[in-house]
């Protein structure tokens, strides 16, 4: 029976945090950073943050953008600072051109 390999401590990254889930914090620490855009009753809601555990974001980050949600993930300190997720557009970008950042 093969010995189980010792688990290495995963690298944690500092991420920009923006949106409802951040409370009063403007950053968080996790194994992946993300920037997301979703639609809430006609408003586009942008959020940024981190996945504490890699598996937590594994499926989310692999999901291709849809008309209702887009998530971009990255690994690296503050790597989501200048990432703004965008919904896919077909030709002319109307009417997917509104965004609303919930604090």
């Amino acid at each position: 029976m093969e010995d189980e390999k010792p688990k290495v401590n995963p690298k944690l990254y500092m991420c920009v945090c923006e949106g409802l889930s951040c409370g009063n914090e403007d950053h968080c620490e996790g194994q992946q950073c993300f920037s997301s855009l979703s639609i809430n009753d006609g408003f586009h809601v942008y959020q940024k943050g981190c996945f504490q555990v890699y598996e937590q974001g594994k499926m989310t980050c692999k999901t291709p953008p849809s008309p209702g949600q887009a998530v971009e993930c990255c690994q690296g300190d503050w790597c989501n600072r200048n990432i703004t997720a965008q919904l896919p557009t077909k030709g002319k970008s109307f009417p997917g051109t509104q965004n609303f950042h919930l604090e």
Epitope: V16, D41, Q98, H101
Partner: antibody, heavy 116, light 108 residues
Framework: EVQLVESGGGLVQPGGSLRLSCAAS????????MSWVRQAPGKGLEWVSA????????YYADSVKGRFTISRDNSKNTLYLQMKSLRVEDTAVYYC?????????WGQGTLVTVSS | DIQMTQSPSSLSASVGDRVTITCRAS??????LNWYQQKPGKAPKLLIY???SLQSGVPSRFSGSGSGTDFTLTISSLQPEDFATYYC??????????FGQGTRLEIK
């Protein structure tokens, strides 16, 4: 073709009321948030009010809070702005626009003049 | 409320010039900054959204950059149809949504 057409503007005395309408076509109106933005003669742009796609959430600039009411009728693809207790400083071209954040497209505007 | 300050308030330039307009936010707004062009008697037109994304149909001579509090709109080679008033607008915070005071671009 996506189109927004405002109507209902005109001359009104201070203290008076007016209701603006914005007829939308060319897109699924109920899916999108909408806003009113105004521009006083020779001045810049001022956001006035916004409403969510369902009409369940509304937002107002402090300058119009308590006097203006935004609403929508998704069955008629129409956005409204009910304006009461109008003041001279409300004189402006009023535009409706898709979304409460980056605005696109815009209507052609309707002029509201508040004067005695 | 987040205040938006544009500079200059007006400028004169010639066809072919490279022009830069700046917009400063009173607090960090990440990249939630949009730019509009308005010609006299007309409704504003969206040029740039999310600081640097060019709106569909807008000529590539227009570009936007910046993040945090400082942003710029650049017109690489001014064309006669570009003489207009330009506005920045933040979409970071929940309402009120705020615009800059505008920059009037005139022919020299």
């Amino acid at each position: 073709e996506v189109q927004l057409v405002e109507s209902g503007g005109g001359l009104v005395q201070p203290g008076g009321s007016l209701r603006l309408s914005c007829a939308a076509s060319g897109f699924t109106f109920s899916t999108y948030a909408m806003s009113w933005v105004r521009q006083a003669p020779g001045k810049g742009l001022e956001w006035v009010s916004a409403i969510s796609g369902s009409g369940g959430s509304t937002y107002y600039a402090d300058s119009v809070k308590g006097r203006f009411t935004i609403s929508r009728d998704n069955s008629k693809n129409t956005l409204y702005l009910q304006m009461k207790s109008l003041r001279v400083e409300d004189t402006a071209v009023y535009y409706c626009a898709n979304s409460p954040s980056w605005f696109d497209p815009w209507g052609q505007g309707t002029l509201v003049t508040v004067s005695s | 409320d987040i205040q938006m300050t544009q500079s200059p308030s007006s400028l004169s330039a010639s066809v072919g010039d490279r022009v830069t307009i700046t917009c400063r936010a009173s607090q960090s707004i990440s990249s939630y900054l949009n730019w509009y062009q308005q010609k006299p008697g007309k409704a504003p037109k969206l040029l740039i959204y999310a600081a640097s994304s060019l709106q569909s149909g807008v000529p590539s001579r227009f570009s936007g950059s910046g993040s945090g509090t400082d942003f710029t709109l650049t017109i690489s080679s001014l064309q006669p149809e570009d003489f207009a008033t330009y506005y920045c607008q933040q979409s970071y915070s929940t309402p009120p949504i705020t615009f800059g005071q505008g920059t009037r671009l005139e022919i020299k």
